[in-house]
């Protein structure tokens, strides 16, 4: 029995619903009484949802899963996962047994966009060319962990003296803090870009130092 799932991961935003597609080709005369369907976590073998003896056996996974009962007879064994959490991320296996048996695994990729970075400067007054300043770029509640890039006003990457740290909250989302230590020129703009690698979403923040006062666009 051939079981088909998408090759690419299913990407779902935290808090939204996701459909993990799985399909099989029922033979003529197929009835749901013949169908055994099991969804489980690929790595831990934990049961997620099942269908047997013509009945939906329900969710074994935090009561957030559902099948598409009206579509099962047509070979649609897809699973609906509600209110996606970071902890849901991973591989799910769809097992289908009629007379024959088949299985396939589909990957769920969870994502959450990062907030627009906030920029802070230390020290933040009486700055002169040649002073060393610490610029902190902070962006919040994203997933997965971000890449952070710094550049100057001319678009030249700044890679030295950068320290980036991630902080996980209780929901598994990340706050990212990146610190750039730089010696000031006569004036300049310093930008940080926080990139979510799954969403290919870039969040930008910048600070312009023009003697006095400073501006935070």
């Amino acid at each position: 029995l051939e079981v088909q799932v998408p090759e690419d991961p299913v990407v779902a935003l935290v808090g939204t619903d996701a459909t993990l597609c799985c399909s099989f080709s029922p033979e003529p005369g197929f009835s749901l009484a013949q169908l055994n369907l099991i969804w489980q976590l690929t790595d831990t073998k934990q049961l997620v949802h099942s269908f047997a003896e013509g009945q939906d056996q329900g969710s074994a996974y935090a009561n957030r899963t559902a099948l598409f009962p009206d579509l099962l007879a047509q070979g649609n064994a897809s699973l609906r996962l509600q209110r996606v959490r970071v902890a849901d991320e991973g591989s799910f296996t769809c097992f289908v047994s009629i007379r024959d048996f088949g299985s396939a695994a589909v990957s769920l990729q969870v994502a959450a966009p990062y907030s627009k970075p906030s920029m802070t400067l230390e020290p933040n007054k009486d700055l002169r060319p040649g002073d060393t300043v610490t610029i902190t770029c902070s962006s919040y509640r994203g997933y997965p962990e971000a890449e952070v890039f710094w550049q100057d006003g001319q678009g030249v990457p700044l890679t030295g003296n950068v320290t980036t740290s991630q902080m996980a909250n209780e929901q598994g989302l990340f706050d990212v803090h990146s610190v750039l230590r730089v010696v000031l020129g006569a004036n300049g703009t310093y930008s940080c870009l926080v990139r979510n690698p799954v969403l290919q979403q870039d969040a930008h923040g910048s600070v312009t130092i023009t003697g006095q006062p400073m501006t935070f666009p």
Epitope: E89, E147, M167
Partner: antibody
């Protein structure tokens, strides 16, 4: 069953290089962040480096190895690597490959048996 | 960097007795703390994650508690195979991922 098997350790002189490998099986390798943790003789555990999952190749290093060590992974071969350059005597340790429990929670739920790296003149 | 301090450095206990190990963080790690056991000549093994959740296959004589900065690993009745070194590790704020210095549990 999850298995992590390190290889590539040995005796080298200060300044030389070594490449460690970790062959993974029993789980969907590409779905998990992976780490190297080391333990100097008679000492405690020290996290060395982490690479995140899929092919995003976002990497992190302990300050003690930054600029000298490079972590990488080949998801098609289910293998994690640690390229160690400019080795120092203080890098002498057993190096463990460790799987992150999840991608947001970086505890280490499975460890290899370790491979010994000795840096000595 | 979050520093983890474990105490005591060595704990002498008789088999069958209770052992209580402490781990203190230099700043709050919420519940992002794990405990590991390392027997001589072996790799570490995960016991507890998220401060109080037992890892797969870990006997229920091992329990973890605490949140914020103060954490405890309790072994209710020490078995011969429990004599080992125990490490705590935080994963709230990284890099670096940091470990405590370890507590050796030895036979009294």
């Amino acid at each position: 069953d999850v298995q992590l098997v390190e290889s590539g350790g040995g005796v080298v002189r200060p300044g030389e290089s070594l490449r460690l490998s970790c062959a993974a099986s029993g789980f969907t390798f590409s779905n998990y962040a992976m780490n190297w943790v080391r333990q100097a003789p008679g000492e405690g555990l020290e996290w060395v480096s982490r690479i995140n999952y899929k092919g995003y190749n976002i990497t992190y290093y302990a300050d003690s190895v930054k600029g000298r060590f490079t972590i990488s992974r080949d998801n098609s071969k289910n293998t994690l690597y640690l390229q160690m350059n400019s080795l120092r005597a203080e890098d002498t340790a057993v190096y463990y490959c460790a799987k992150s429990g999840s991608n947001s929670n970086n505890f280490f739920d499975y460890w290899g048996l370790g491979t010994l790296v000795t840096v000595s003149s | 960097e979050i520093v983890l301090t474990q105490s005591p450095g060595t704990l002498s206990v008789s088999p069958g007795e209770r052992a209580t190990l402490s781990c203190r963080a230099s700043q709050s790690v919420n519940s992002k703390l794990a405990w590991y056991q390392q027997r001589p000549g072996q790799a570490p093994r995960l016991l507890i994650y998220d401060a109080s959740s037992r890892a797969t296959g870990i006997p229920d004589r091992f329990s973890g508690s605490g949140s914020g900065t103060d954490f405890t690993l309790t072994i209710s009745r020490l078995e011969p195979e429990d004599f080992a070194v125990y490490y705590c590790q935080q994963y709230k704020n990284w890099p670096p991922l940091t470990f405590g210095g370890g507590t050796k549990v030895e036979i009294k």
